[in-house]
């Protein structure tokens, strides 16, 4: 997926991927923080939610996000043994009926209220990274990841696999 030719080749795979079950395989309530331990917080402003990346005060409670895990298939030309390979995809919901969405046109991450079935923009391929971190790749835009830019979440293009470990696309999940 990463590396210009890789991204172009892999675009087909993620776009064509199918969520194999309508219901998630499991769910997990966790706080989300950056590689540098800044918290991802959600604030209701003018009847819409804003997403912030900030340092919390000492005893300030961390916001929680419900991660719903889905098993997803992707085409055999990118997987194994001439059959579909498997990926783990997630949706992220900080509050009832709201989900993180990838806005690929604006390169932004937004909270949208929507009903199930959720649109593809709400699904992210979950990557198991080094140093107990994860990253979130847009289902709708392979090679593009949720990242941190100017104390906000944004969509960041990763153009080579060497850049996949860039700190601004690495996140930590914690139950506390």
């Amino acid at each position: 997926a990463f590396g210009i030719s890789g991204v172009q080749k892999y675009t087909r795979a993620l776009h064509d991927s199918s969520i194999t079950g309508i219901s998630p395989i499991t769910e997990y309530l966790a706080s989300l923080s950056t590689y540098n331990d800044q918290s991802i917080t959600f604030a209701l402003e003018d009847e819409s939610y804003e997403i912030y990346v900030e340092d919390l005060k000492k005893d300030e409670k961390k916001d929680k996000v419900l991660l719903s895990y889905y098993e997803s298939q992707h085409p055999s030309n990118e997987s194994g043994d001439g059959v579909d390979g498997k990926m783990l995809m997630v949706t992220l919901s900080p509050t009832k009926d709201f989900w993180l969405h990838a806005n690929n046109k604006e390169h932004s991450v937004e909270l949208h209220k929507c009903e199930k079935p959720l649109p593809d923009q709400a699904f992210f391929v979950l990557h198991n990274m080094h140093s107990n971190c994860v990253s979130f790749e847009c289902k709708t835009d392979p090679g593009v990841f949720i990242g941190v830019k100017d104390n906000h979440l944004a969509l960041i293009k990763v153009d080579s696999s060497e850049n996949l470990c860039t700190e601004n696309i690495l996140f930590k999940l914690s139950e506390t």
Partner: antibody, heavy 119, light 111 residues
Framework: EVQLVESGGGLVQPGGSLRLSCAAS????????LSWVRQAPGKGLEWVAT????????DYVDSVKGRFTISRDNSKNTLYLQMNSLRAEDTAVYYC????????????WGQGTLVTVSS | EIVLTQSPATLSLSPGERATLSCRAS??????????LNWFQQKPGQPPRLLIF???NRGSGVPARFSGSGSGTDFTLTISSLEPEDFAVYFC?????????FGQGTKVEIK
Amino acid sequence: EVQLVESGGGLVQPGGSLRLSCAASGFTFSSFSLSWVRQAPGKGLEWVATISGGKTFTDYVDSVKGRFTISRDNSKNTLYLQMNSLRAEDTAVYYCTRANYGNWFFEVWGQGTLVTVSS
Amino acid sequence: EIVLTQSPATLSLSPGERATLSCRASESVAKYGLSLLNWFQQKPGQPPRLLIFAASNRGSGVPARFSGSGSGTDFTLTISSLEPEDFAVYFCQQSKEVPFTFGQGTKVEIK
């Protein structure tokens, strides 16, 4: 079709060196984490080493640290395992494995190459 | 390191019977809300084949007679009705942390 084909195995004396190769095809090589897993004759499986897609991270089982080096050439779609200071207990079939997309589990395996360390 | 203990070492059954294989971890293999415990099948002279990932999800092309369950430290692989091609060795493996470790295997043999 996705394929992993190992080569480079053979008979080597204790203290000797060997370099294993794994030629990959059928997928975007640099997007996937790759590992070596070995199996001594008639025994179980043992993970040996892993390298990330971008070559940034490597991990090893303690018993091979300082002796084995995992590497990859993304331009040649090839994974390597350089094995130095070989011991009798390194005798095994060495499998090249590819993680799934997202790096959660070993999804694809090669057929393996046999390394025999004996005098 | 996380030690995985499989039982029984050998299971002698007939085709059509139900097989229940156990894998116990020395500590929890849960991470990010997932049970990072996988099952592989291996036949003589062949590489392992992924059957189950994240405790309960079938790998690509794996028949529905194979199912996985469990969480935390105790896991089970069930083959609902053994087919002749299912007689093999089965390994559990944890991908929670390095070093990635495997169980010693359970051999399912024809009775």
